[in-house]
């Protein structure tokens, strides 16, 4: 008895092990930067200038529903979002033929470490409240990927993260930059 | 040849900042990203981030909790690492390391070090 | 933090003899696992990644394996140049991590 069974009041799946939901765009554009402090206790990852290149926990408060009946209080639930910067693809072009070249390995923001939370589930018409277990994630990590996963695990990610198609380069291509533009920051 | 030249040793009193320089040849700087690997006398190694020079996007390991800058500058094909605030214990030999690649295998490695900067925090 | 551990520390060896360092991660790593050789006061040099493809020009007698979370490095008939500190480094989980290293010297 899994947290596939629940369903928030959006009707919205809380997701389970191994799926990885795009959450909302945030509002607040500062709430992640590192002197703001706004970082949980085992946040992998921090992005000082807000940006793509960004691997967090975000918390998300909501009541879960199992039916005809809702918890009692409402759960907080964590979600592991963005990308784990800096970029490591980089567009590369010789004429008309493009591709994606690598500058490092790819790694992706997941789930590292859950926790078990019991939630009580209040029933209308005086029916007996129902106890469930729920399995909630508590940390994220930056995990490596490998060319072979698939690419549809990818599609909440931005456009330089995604894998290179078949016809890229086996190395890096040399392709020149500007010097140094704004600085993209993240701390593992 | 593809070598990493570092700038020369530092000595700092505690609080101040220090900036090391790595100057890359032999390869085309923004094809690989730099990363900087620390070692404390007698001790391991400690990896202290990463920074793209195409995009100057950085990343580093959150131990070092905003003390540290990673910058380039592609013009001279040269890397920085700045650390602010410095205490005793960030008394250390820093590398800059190019990482490469293995296209077959899809995996990377640290192929290419500079010398070595050592870096004393004393007062 | 993926924590490398290994072992043993340091270790005793004659030239000829065939020396194994083991190298065992907190979680698992899959093959993302390196191994260095460095010298005193010398940078670290690559000698295995992948967790057993030598580098071009490292002597065959090195050789690596393993999967997972427990990994080795065996030299199958130590050298006189052989005698140096080694680390295995993982690439699998940000941020990178490094073993504590092993110290092959001289008997």
């Known amino acids: 008895q899994g947290w596939q069974a629940f369903r928030n009041d959006a009707t919205e799946v809380i997701p389970g092990l191994g799926e990885y939901p795009e959450p909302p765009p945030e509002n607040n554009q500062t709430m992640n930067r590192a002197e703001n402090g706004g970082r949980p206790p085992h946040h992998p990852y921090d992005a000082k200038d807000v940006s793509e290149y960004s691997c967090r926990e975000l918390h998300y408060t909501r009541f879960l529903t199992d039916g005809p009946c809702r918890s009692a209080k409402p759960v907080t639930e964590l979600v592991c979002s963005g990308q784990c910067g800096p970029a490591r693809l980089l567009p590369n072009a010789i004429g008309r033929v493009k591709w994606w070249r690598p500058n490092g390995p790819d790694f992706r923001c997941i789930p590292d470490r859950y926790r078990a939370q019991r939630v009580q589930l209040l029933c209308p018409g005086g029916a007996a409240p129902r106890s469930r277990k729920v399995r909630l994630v508590a940390s994220c990590k930056c995990k490596r990927l490998t060319r072979f996963h698939n690419q549809s695990e990818l599609k909440d990610f931005g456009p330089e993260t995604a894998r290179p198609q078949k016809g890229r380069k086996p190395r890096p291509g040399a392709r020149g930059a500007k010097a140094n533009q704004a600085e993209l920051e993240n701390a593992y | 040849e593809v070598q990493l030249v570092q700038s020369g040793a530092e000595v700092k009193k505690p609080g101040a900042s220090v900036k090391v320089s790595c100057k890359a040849s032999?390869?085309?700087?923004?094809?690989?990203?730099m990363h900087w690997v620390r070692q404390a006398p007698g001790q391991g190694l400690e990896w202290m981030g990463e920074?793209?020079?195409?995009?100057?996007?950085?990343g580093y390991n959150q131990k070092f909790k905003g003390r540290v800058t990673m910058t380039t500058d592609t013009s001279t094909s040269t890397a920085y690492m700045e650390l602010r605030s410095l205490r005793s214990d960030d008394t250390a030999v820093y590398y800059c390391?190019?990482?490469?690649?293995?296209?077959?295998?899809?995996?990377?490695?640290?192929?290419?070090w500079g010398q070595g900067t050592t870096v004393t925090v004393s007062s | 933090d993926i924590q490398m551990t290994q072992s043993p520390s340091s270790l005793s060896a004659s030239v000829g003899d065939r020396v194994t360092i083991t190298c065992r991660a907190s979680?698992?790593?899959?093959?993302?696992l390196n191994w260095y050789q460095q010298k005193p006061g010398k940078a670290p040099k690559l000698l295995i990644y992948?967790?057993?493809r030598l580098l071009s020009g490292v002597p065959s007698r090195f050789s690596g394996s393993g999967s997972g979370t427990d990994f080795t490095l065996t030299i199958s008939s130590l050298q006189p140049e052989d005698f140096a500190t080694y680390y295995c480094?993982?690439?699998?989980?940000?941020?990178?991590?490094f073993g504590g290293g092993t110290k092959v010297e001289i008997k």
């Open positions: 390391a190019r990482l490469g690649y293995d296209d077959i295998y899809d995996d990377w490695y640290f192929d290419v």
């Open positions: 979680q698992d790593i899959s093959n993302y």
């Open positions: 920074i793209n020079p195409n995009s100057g996007g950085a």
């Open positions: 032999g390869y085309t700087f923004t094809d690989y990203n």
């Open positions: 480094q993982q690439g699998d989980t940000l941020p990178y991590t």
């Open positions: 992948h967790t057993s």
